[in-house]
């Protein structure tokens, strides 16, 4: 759920790493209310996820490793 490119709330679903091509970080500031990880899926969707949740951290770690290898 996002508004003007800001996540307003987090997904209540768990996504598989195979579904995700990348991510961006949203930091809470004067523009956006919450910290979020925005996952970009193979279907072209942007999914707002809670950066404190373990499953989110795992995927971020996996994707970061991939990026560092390139």
């Amino acid at each position: 759920a996002s508004n003007f490119d800001c996540c307003l709330r987090y997904t209540d679903r768990i996504l598989h790493p195979k579904f995700i091509v990348g991510f961006t970080q949203q930091l809470a500031n004067e523009t956006c209310d919450i910290n979020a990880v925005v996952f970009h899926t193979k279907k072209g969707l942007s999914v707002c996820a809670n950066p404190k949740q373990t499953w989110v951290k795992l995927i971020v770690r996996r994707l970061s490793k991939k990026i560092n290898k390139m």
Epitope: R13, I14, L15, H16, K18, F19, K42, K52, Q53, T54, W55, L58
Partner: antibody
Framework: QVQLVQSGAEVKKPGASVKVSCKAS????????MHWVRQAPGQGLEWMGV????????TYAQKFQGRVTMTVDTSTSTVYMELSSLRSEDTAVYYC?????????????WGQGTLVTVSS | DIQMTQSPSSLSASVGDRVTITCRAS??????LNWYQQKPGKAPKLLIY???NLADGVPSRFSGSGSGRQYSLTISSLQPEDFATYYC?????????FGGGTKLEIK
């Protein structure tokens, strides 16, 4: 070795609640998710939801939203599944299963199952 | 939610036969698919994860293949202990839906 031991069979009246436990041993409890799957007599498998013991994050199938609650006690490596407002269609074997994101998010170990019978 | 359709729902075969069970997803699940075996009165057992990978301790006569929306489980030479019910499962996104199952019976 990995073991998931579930609580015993239950008989409940319609409208009541049931709480099933699943005690894990043989692995680092907080490193794996715990799923709950049920199977009505003669039917297939139905995924109910999952809990992450490391942060107590839960997500439930829409069908059970508002009726199911999954909780965790890390001190005893036990996960609980409570289902409320029981009806006859909830008669089933309820399984806990370890979710392993290292093997493609598969459920690699299962409890022995707990039969819950809902009958007036 | 992603729907998983298994076929056939039941299958009769003989020891030594080669059998294939198929599973079709309602949308692309990018190989995020697992297969389980269940015997009567027992809990399911993981056979294949990630569409093609054999779980620990599973005999090599079992194999998984497929991509996109279409997946299959093949048993190259049926053994007496393989007569059971088989389920596929989507793990791309919750809810982690199962197929309806395929009951493999002795002919």
């Amino acid at each position: 070795q990995v073991q998931l031991v579930q609580s015993g069979a239950e008989v409940k009246k319609p409208g009541a609640s049931v709480k099933v436990s699943c005690k894990a041993s043989g692995y680092t409890f907080t490193n794996y998710w715990m799923h709950w799957v049920r199977q009505a007599p003669g039917q297939g498998l139905e995924w109910m939801g999952v809990i992450d013991p490391s942060d107590s994050y839960t997500t439930y199938a829409q069908k059970f939203q508002g009726r199911v609650t999954m909780t965790v006690d890390t001190s005893t490596s036990t996960v609980y599944m409570e289902l409320s407002s029981l009806r006859s269609e909830d008669t089933a074997v309820y399984y806990c299963a370890r979710g392993n994101y290292g093997v493609d998010y598969a459920m690699d170990y299962w409890g022995q199952g707990t039969l819950v019978t809902v009958s007036s | 939610d992603i729907q998983m359709t298994q076929s056939p729902s039941s299958l009769s075969a003989s020891v030594g036969d080669r059998v294939t069970i198929t599973c079709r997803a309602s949308e692309n699940i990018y190989g995020a698919l697992n297969w389980y075996q269940q015997k009567p009165g027992k809990a399911p057992k993981l056979l294949i994860y990630g569409a093609t990978n054999l779980a620990d301790g599973v005999p090599s006569r079992f194999s998984g293949s497929g991509s996109g929306r279409q997946y299959s489980l093949t048993i190259s030479s049926l053994q007496p202990e393989d007569f059971a019910t088989y389920y596929c499962q989507n793990v791309l996104i919750t809810p982690y839906t199962f197929g309806g199952g395929t009951k493999l019976e002795i002919k």
